[in-house]
């Protein structure tokens, strides 16, 4: 059946009409408009942009557009007391200081309010001491240092290169190792692609460029002072000592010119292997401290940033559904940027703007979606996903009852090679079917589908002839919807070739050089990749909001559950003796997965055959589909992470950006051989298997015939 039948509208208002209305030229124009000045969260400039977007969404035709404000903890450098790092001699004189800010890009020399590079939420402090180089500061890097090399980081200032994992995890690891300060830097090995010029002549990071970013370990809490509840006018706020996720040691980021000065003098141990060497002309010695001639010199950090409760503003637009107005499909992306936001977030915000305009055009012609579509421009994402989380906390009762799906819309591009999708398994078939209908923008794939170019360039590691779709992790605004509330979620963007470009993210990420010109000159001059991403994101929203039967396939969840069960079992089987000793069995989990598979298969058969003209039965079947994701939520949450409640997926405890499957079991098994009380540790593994098995079985039963 056509996805329009239920809304009694003319056939011309279908997905094609929506997609045809999307224009690359408009996305380009919107991107330019959004990137001329900085839009840092909590600033007047970002408030003005919120009001502009509110006004334009109203003009585009949405039914209502409101600002939702919250007063949350943000962090800013001290304008009169800048942050920097020094090398000091034995007399305490500063013989080298890091740069106070990045040289501005051409055309932006006279722009005011460019926030200098800083690590948001760093405490104040002026620690001094010997330096230890800790590679990427991953869990395994500290294992190598402490266990294999017997290097003690206690009382040291550590220097870590950006990349591989979320910076907050690096800081947490350094704290646990006893460090008294952290210096983060961008190594050319990770942020300078060979054969490409640095900005403004290419998309590589110049030596004076620096990555900003927050260093929180919120674990989904939102505003650090009001975990679990909205930061509204009558909120009770924790004291700063009880705030969630704040780092306890000073942290500061630098570029590779300044890193060279710190690393070139390093003495102590040689790097353990080549994976610890970057591309600077330095030895990458681990330390501690400087080499012979410089051994009396120390490193000193000067950090004076302040944490301040500040008002932020989300923009929430509503396009009311004609048939099921109490079912919400949400498209959201953030508006706040570190500086100009040329890629992050405005390449995404410009796409959302054009999607809203297209939906508005259809609405003005008399069309309405079947279900309500909510559009969101989130604030303070860069400070810990605060805007989206506070709004979801405020509206959690509505969302858990009415939320069908959330589609995220941060950066539309991180490269221009192929599509990248992370989503719930429920959306796999939706994404496959949609991309088969869209044209590929890729060179050499003229006249071919997006599905074809995507599958060719990014094949699934498991299923031939299919594209790779990844697990959702975190580090973006879908987190609260998926990990806390259990609303089916997905994200899509254009990405780089991970085979040939091993650098982390894109080189100019969170630097002053992330400008409109970066996108227009080097990434997407024709804005054809932006248009494709608009078609994917918008197409997903259209289908989720308009199809009579929700475009979710529960059988795909069954497939991945089996895969994840196999994976976690094989991890556990690395300890066969202990599994025997402590009677650890995965039978209950595999049994639950088998049951889920059978019940999902039967449900899918019923879904093909039921009478779609019966609105009660239709609603019943759709509710079973909608609530399936919700069924994977454990109200008690994961151990020590109460806001990560999804039993199948959570952000990795070692890298917030990455998704982990069966995270409760995974974390219980992690490094289990080093636990002081093996009996207790394996007891926790058994408990987590029990929780996972119960949850999968309970979720399966939500798909059973209701009576």
């Amino acid at each position: 059946k056509s996805s329009n039948e239920a809304t009694n509208i003319t056939p011309k208002h279908n997905m094609k009409a929506f997609l045809d209305e999307l224009k690359a030229e408009n996305i380009k124009k919107f991107l330019y408009n959004f990137t001329q000045i900085p839009h840092l969260a909590g600033t007047e400039q970002n408030f003005q942009l919120a009001k502009q977007i509110q006004s334009q969404w109203k003009e585009f035709g949405l039914d209502s557009v409101e600002l939702a404000h919250y007063d949350v903890l943000l962090s800013y450098p001290n304008k009169t007391h800048p942050n920097y790092i020094s090398i000091i001699n034995e007399d305490g004189n500063e013989i080298f200081n890091t740069s106070l800010f990045e040289p501005p890009p051409p055309g932006y020399e006279n722009v005011s309010d460019i926030v200098p590079p800083f690590s948001a939420f760093s405490p104040q402090g002026m620690p001094e001491g010997d330096l230890v180089y800790v590679n990427y500061a991953r869990t395994e890097d500290f294992f190598k240092l402490e266990r294999d090399m017997k290097i003690n980081c206690s009382g040291k200032i550590v220097i870590a290169r950006y990349g591989k994992v979320f910076r907050g995890n690096k800081v947490k690891n350094a704290q646990l190792a006893g460090a008294k300060g952290v210096i983060l830097y961008s190594d050319p090995a990770d942020y300078f692609a060979p054969g490409v010029k640095s900005y403004p002549d290419g998309w590589n990071l110049p030596g004076g460029g620096v990555q900003r970013g927050n260093i929180l370990n919120l674990n989904g809490a939102g505003d650090p002072l009001t975990p679990g509840y909205p930061a509204n006018e009558y909120a009770y706020r924790r004291g700063i000592a009880e705030a969630v996720g704040l780092p306890s040691i000073p942290v500061h980021p630098i570029g590779y010119y300044d890193a060279q000065k710190l690393l070139e003098k390093m003495g102590g141990s040689a790097p353990p292997d080549s994976s610890w060497r970057g591309s600077l002309k330095v030895p990458y010695n681990v330390g501690p401290g400087f080499t012979g001639n410089f051994s009396t010199q120390k490193v000193k950090m000067h950090i004076h940033s302040t944490n301040e409760v500040t008002r932020i503003y989300n923009v929430i637009g509503t396009l009311r559904g004609a048939v099921e107005p109490d079912r919400y499909v949400i498209l959201g992306g953030h508006r706040d940027s570190w500086v100009f936001g040329g890629i992050d977030p405005q390449s995404g915000a410009a796409v959302v703007h054009e999607i809203v305009r297209s939906f508005g055009t259809l609405k003005k012609e008399g069309w309405r979606p079947r279900r309500t579509i909510l559009f969101a421009s989130w604030d303070a994402e860069e400070f810990g996903l605060l805007g989206s989380t506070e709004w979801a906390e405020e509206n959690s009762r509505l969302l858990q009852e009415r939320g069908v799906a959330y589609i995220n819309a941060d950066s539309s591009i991180e490269g221009n090679y192929t599509l990248r999708v992370d989503c719930t398994p429920l959306m796999y078939s939706l994404v496959h079917n949609l991309t088969k209908e869209l044209k590929s923008p890729d060179e050499g794939f003229e006249g071919k589908s997006l599905y074809e170019s995507w599958t060719k360039k990014s094949p699934s590691p498991e299923f031939s002839g299919m594209p790779r779709i990844s697990k959702l992790g975190s580090g973006n605004d879908f987190e609260v919807f998926f990990q806390r509330l259990g609303i089916a979620s997905g994200r899509a963007r254009y990405t780089k070739n991970w085979e040939t470009n091993k650098f982390s993210g894109y080189p100019l990420y969170h630097s002053v050089y992330e400008t409109y010109e970066l996108v227009e000159k080097f990434y997407d001059p024709m804005f054809k990749y932006h248009l494709t991403v608009a078609q994917v994101r918008g197409g997903m929203v259209f289908e989720l909001a308009n199809s009579i039967v929700l475009p979710f396939d529960c059988r795909d969840y069954a497939v991945v559950l089996r895969k994840y069960a196999d994976k976690i079992y094989s991890i556990s089987m690395k300890h066969p003796q202990e599994m025997k000793t402590y009677s650890v069995s995965f039978d209950s989990l595999f049994s639950a997965v088998k049951n889920f598979t059978e019940i999902a298969s039967k449900f899918s058969e019923r879904l093909q055959d039921f009478d779609k003209s019966n609105p009660i039965v239709l609603r019943m079947m759709n509710d079973q589909l909608m609530f399936l994701e919700r069924a994977f939520i454990d109200p008690l949450g994961l151990p020590d992470r109460p806001f990560y409640r999804h039993v199948i997926y959570a952000p990795s405890s070692h890298n917030k950006y990455a998704g982990e499957s069966f995270p409760g079991i995974y974390d219980a098994l992690f490094d289990i051989e080093s636990k002081v009380d093996p009996s207790k540790a394996w007891g926790e593994v058994k408990r987590q298997i029990y929780v996972a098995a119960f949850t999968v079985q309970a979720a399966a039963e939500t798909l059973s015939e209701v009576a």
Partner: antibody, heavy 120, light 106 residues
Framework: EVQLVESGGGLVQPGGSLRLSCAAS????????MAWVRQAPGKGLEWVAN????????YYLDSLKSRFTISRDNAKNSLYLQMNSLRAEDTAVYYC?????????????WGQGTTVTVSS | EIVLTQSPDFQSVTPKEKVTIQCSAS?????MYWYQQKPDQSPKPWIY???NLASGVPSRFSGSGSGTDYTLTINSLEAEDAATYYC?????????FGQGTKLEIK
């Protein structure tokens, strides 16, 4: 040996034109931004113009933008400065310089300079 | 445009003495460069990115500073150091030089 050799200087009347050339050798010319810097008699250094690797972007001292044009020919390892509507205050030694840090300008190799005299 | 002001304009110094030349920027800059020029010679790169010595520069020279205030220091002056020193900002166009500081040996 890395070398820059300027030529084309001389005496010119006010309102006249001159084209300076700089021949580069001993390095991969197209891998560097290049610049012209001048020094009036008994005065300090004054940056005139920069050009990026392939000549697609040029940057000038504002007061000279309408009269001076920097260009390069990578095939010939050569840098040029076309100077029109010359004035007495343009009298200076003009140095060609290699710019090590790209757009932001650190001049690590200098030529010996060529003298331009604007006088009637 | 960022104006760089060097002080002093001129300094007459005894060999072995410590010398400091200041360069003050009208607004903050990211890095400072220094050049040495002797009479009838081209300028030579001397210190780059605030504190790095160019190739062949003696270790008695050092550079430091950040923001608006930068310093070139000669720990123990030698006769061959007599020259004019120029600072230059690495920050924004137009690229600008200080007016120069002439060092003379007493």
């Amino acid at each position: 040996e890395v070398q820059l050799v300027e030529s084309g200087g001389g005496l010119v009347q006010p309102g006249g034109s001159l084209r300076l050339s700089c021949a580069a050798s001993g390095f991969t010319f197209s891998d560097y931004y290049m610049a012209w810097v001048r020094q009036a008699p008994g005065k300090g250094l004054e940056w005139v113009a920069n050009i990026n690797y392939d000549g697609s972007s040029t940057y000038y001292l504002d007061s000279l933008k309408s009269r001076f044009t920097i260009s390069r020919d990578n095939a010939k390892n050569s840098l040029y400065l076309q100077m029109n509507s010359l004035r007495a205050e343009d009298t200076a030694v003009y140095y060609c310089a290699r710019d090590l840090d790209g757009y932001y300008g650190y001049f690590d190799v200098w030529g010996q300079g060529t003298t331009v005299t604007v006088s009637s | 445009e960022i104006v760089l002001t060097q002080s002093p304009d001129f300094q007459s110094v005894t060999p072995k003495e410590k010398v400091t030349i200041q360069c003050s920027a009208s607004s903050s800059v990211s890095y400072m460069y220094w050049y040495q020029q002797k009479p009838d010679q081209s300028p030579k790169p001397w210190i780059y990115r605030t504190s790095n010595l160019a190739s062949g520069v003696p270790s008695r020279f050092s550079g430091s500073g950040s923001g608006t205030d930068y310093t070139l220091t000669i720990n123990s002056l030698e006769a061959e150091d007599a020259a004019t020193y120029y600072c230059q900002q690495y920050h924004s166009y137009p690229l600008t030089f200080g007016q120069g500081t002439k060092l003379e040996i007493k």
